[in-house]
């Protein structure tokens, strides 16, 4: 602890100029004071001034008022500093002396004589308020006041608490009257050394070095550091933890940059045609009647559907067509005949049957021919009977469907599961795709069927084809091929045609 006992001398009265021994001072009592401060004693005794002592210069002669003086000799109030915890009790001895010698340092003069002394014993709490008192004896009177205050930076009832305001990285605070810390705005903690971060800053993913700040830890972003940063290069994907790249619907590949749903994202097929996805950026448009072109953007001639019968010739008109009928036929589509069986109207061996009492006829066509006059050869593929991309082929009187891999049945309507025979080795996961099964291999294996064990730097052998980029370290003991546009497969070995709905991990 550290404090100061302060004694303010106010007035001393010695009207007769007498000493304690009854003698008078000639020409008057040139008065100075000795003060002794010590621990509390019920009976004041001689001995060391344990709390301190001080002497004044000559302050006046006989009777005088003592003025306050803040510096130099004759300082008033008198200061008795101490470097211990103030006990709350004390004994004080104030002696008035006459000196015939030096005004400034009377202590050192020989022949000094005691005028009077007073002794005060009691309790005194630390505080700013002065305690005033007056002591009389038969010859003199002394008016004075005193108090105990703490030294700078010391606080509390006994001046025992040290506190120094500071504003650096070991604390940002001021001191309360009791010596406790009062944090500056924006700071917290026992020593006010912890900044209060921006409100809402994520506790784990963000921090701050000064108030109202939110600095993100690696892998996090956003004003409050509550948004993860996806894998570098992630195009159409999101993350729930840092460096993830979970693809949005319709996107695939390591960086979610392969468009698996070109139809939905770009709507390339026009005029009400049907769009079918066929791998990254791949699609086909199935046109409605009357349209053609890669995107069904071209309108067909109104005559394209061959509406004119019986050999009539078709002429396009605005929003319509017109049939020019051959001799013997009439009607909008030349469907009415003026011919009879006598005119031999049936071609390709068709049999003529008279109708309406010979005023018209009907042809019964042999196999593979059709039309009102058996003039058309039958095309059994016009109805698009083959499903799942199967190719229709005319075979004489019948037709057959040539199915794409993975499909079977008369109309290619049945899907074959290539994964049923478990083609993937070493615990690889099988995926049924249009062009056959594809295996996703566990760590440490590669190959189309996961049959190759990896024992070295997976990318060293250059396993990726068609200019693909090889990555290792994305998971233990494996590599990943990031395919260029137009190729898929674990090594980017397949041209577009099957959608990679999962990352290709070899």
């Amino acid at each position: 602890g550290s404090g100061i006992f302060q004694l303010r001398l106010q007035e001393f009265v010695n009207q007769r100029g007498m000493l304690a021994n009854g003698q008078s001072c000639e020409p008057g009592c040139r008065t100075f004071f000795r003060i002794c401060l010590k621990h509390f004693q019920a009976t004041f005794s001689e001995g060391p001034c344990t709390f301190g002592n001080v002497s004044t210069p000559v302050l006046g002669t006989n009777s005088f008022v003592v003025r306050d003086k803040n510096s130099g000799s004759g300082r008033n109030p008198l200061q008795l500093p101490f470097n211990f915890t103030w006990p709350g009790t004390f004994s004080l001895n104030i002696q008035a002396w006459h000196t015939p010698g030096d005004d400034l340092r009377p202590e050192t003069s020989p022949g000094n004589s005691l005028i009077s002394q007073i002794i005060i014993q009691g309790s005194l709490a630390v505080g700013k308020i002065w305690r005033t008192d007056e002591q009389n004896d038969t010859l003199t009177r002394l008016s004075y006041s005193y108090r105990v205050i703490c030294s700078d930076n010391y606080y509390g009832e006994s001046c025992s608490r040290l506190c120094k305001k500071r504003d650096d990285h070991f604390g940002h605070y001021e001191c309360q009257p009791d010596g406790s810390l009062s944090c500056l705005p924006g700071w917290t903690g026992k020593y006010c050394d912890q900044p209060i971060c921006l409100s809402g800053c994520h506790e784990q993913n963000g921090y701050c070095s000064k108030p109202d700040e939110c600095i993100c830890r690696p892998g996090w972003q956003g004003r409050l550091c509550n948004e993860c940063i996806p894998h570098n290069g992630c195009r159409h994907g999101t993350c729930s933890i840092p460096w993830q790249c979970a693809c949005d619907e319709g996107w695939g590949g390591l960086f979610c940059d392969q468009d698996l749903n070109y139809c939905t994202h770009h709507s390339p097929c026009k005029n009400g045609s049907t769009c079918s996805n066929s791998g990254p950026k791949g699609y086909t448009c199935t046109c409605l009647p009357g349209y053609t072109g890669e995107h069904c953007e071209l309108g067909l001639s109104k005559c394209a559907s061959n509406p004119c019968r019986n050999g009539g010739s078709c002429k396009d008109q605005e929003n319509s067509y017109h049939c020019l009928c051959p001799p013997g036929y009439y009607g909008q589509h030349c469907e009415h005949s003026t011919l009879t069986c006598a005119d031999s109207p049936c071609f390709n061996g068709g049999s003529c049957r008279e109708r309406n009492q010979g005023s018209s006829y009907a042809c019964e066509c042999p196999p593979n021919f059709t039309g009102s006059n058996c003039e058309k050869k039958v095309d059994r593929c016009t109805s698009n009977p083959c499903a799942n991309g199967g190719q229709c082929q005319n075979r004489g009187p019948s037709r057959t469907c040539r199915c794409r891999p993975g499909f079977t049945g008369t109309h290619c309507e049945l899907h074959i599961s290539d994964c049923a025979r478990s083609p993937c080795a070493h615990g690889g996961t099988c995926h049924d795709l249009e062009n056959g099964p594809v295996c996703t291999c566990p760590a440490g294996f590669s190959g189309r069927r996961c049959e190759v064990r990896i024992t070295h730097d997976a990318c060293a052998s250059g396993p990726c084809f068609n200019g693909a980029t090889c990555y290792t370290g994305l998971s233990p003991n494996n590599f990943v091929c990031n395919c260029p546009y137009g190729f898929v497969g674990s090594r980017c070995e397949f041209p577009v045609g099957l959608p990679p709905s999962f990352p290709w991990v070899a």
Partner: antibody, heavy 121, light 106 residues
Framework: EVQLQESGPGLVKPSETLSLTCTVS??????????WGWIRQPPGKGLEWIGD???????YYNPSLKSRVTISVDTSKNQFSLKLSSVTAADTAVYYC?????????????WGQGTLVTVSS | SYELTQPPSVSVSPGQTASITCSGE??????VSWYQQKPGQSPVLVIY???TRPSGIPERFSGSNSGDTATLTISGTQPMDEADYYC?????????FGSGTKVTVL
């Protein structure tokens, strides 16, 4: 009890970068109660504070060295490091790492044993 | 920049009191630490926050700080106390060491 151990090359060529690492054992460098400092002492001379850092990476440097000093922390390894660039013979000193306690008003209650770094060609 | 000044040396007889001063502008308003360093050894903290002794430091070491001067006092000095002593304070965000005082026990 916490122990600090400096490591790094004892000889550095002029104009190069001095790099030292302090490994903390027996306590976590991630405590908010401490800053981790570097102090140096040229042969036969007094102590000079270089700078310090806390677990979050907040750094404070001696203004006279600030342009050349970088202090960093690696909480996963319980280490902090000093880099001093463009060194000259005047940077020859024993380099100490120390723990500065917030509760002690910034007093350094634990020190490494020090490592002598000589700058010479 | 802020500076702390110490006397280069102080001599004391065994059993006597050694006082080492450390002066700096407004030093009384800053917390002062004192370090003891023996030859070939790392510094050891003997006083922090002006007058507090860390555990393990003998009671003969005490400190005070007011005005522009901080003082480290070694009462009943022993031969083992012969060492260099450094005061240290924080000026804003910067640590500042005194120039050091060599204490010789005669």
């Amino acid at each position: 009890e916490v122990q600090l151990q400096e490591s790094g090359p004892g000889l550095v060529k002029p104009s190069e970068t001095l790099s030292l690492t302090c490994t903390v054992s027996g306590g976590s460098i991630s405590s908010s109660n401490y800053y981790w400092g570097w102090i140096r002492q040229p042969p036969g001379k007094g102590l000079e504070w270089i700078g310090d850092i806390n677990y979050n990476g907040n750094t404070y440097y001696n203004p006279s060295l600030k342009s050349r000093v970088t202090i960093s922390v690696d909480t996963s390894k319980n280490q902090f490091s000093l880099k001093l660039s463009s060194v000259t013979a005047a940077d020859t000193a024993v380099y100490y790492c120390a723990r500065e306690a917030v509760a002690l008003g910034g007093g350094a209650d634990d020190w490494g044993q020090g490592t002598l770094v000589t700058v010479s060609s | 920049s802020y500076e702390l000044t110490q006397p280069p040396s102080v001599s004391v007889s065994p059993g006597q009191t050694a006082s080492i001063t450390c002066s700096g502008e407004g030093l009384g308003d800053k917390y002062v630490s004192w370090y003891q360093q023996k030859p070939g050894q790392s510094p050891v903290l003997v006083i922090y926050e002006d007058s507090t002794r860390p555990s393990g430091i003998p009671e003969r070491f005490s400190g005070s700080n007011s005005g522009d001067t901080a003082t480290l006092t070694i009462s009943g000095t022993q031969p083992m106390d012969e060492a260099d002593y450094y005061c240290q304070a924080w000026d804003s965000e910067t640590g500042v060491f005194g120039s050091g005082t060599k204490v010789t026990v005669l």
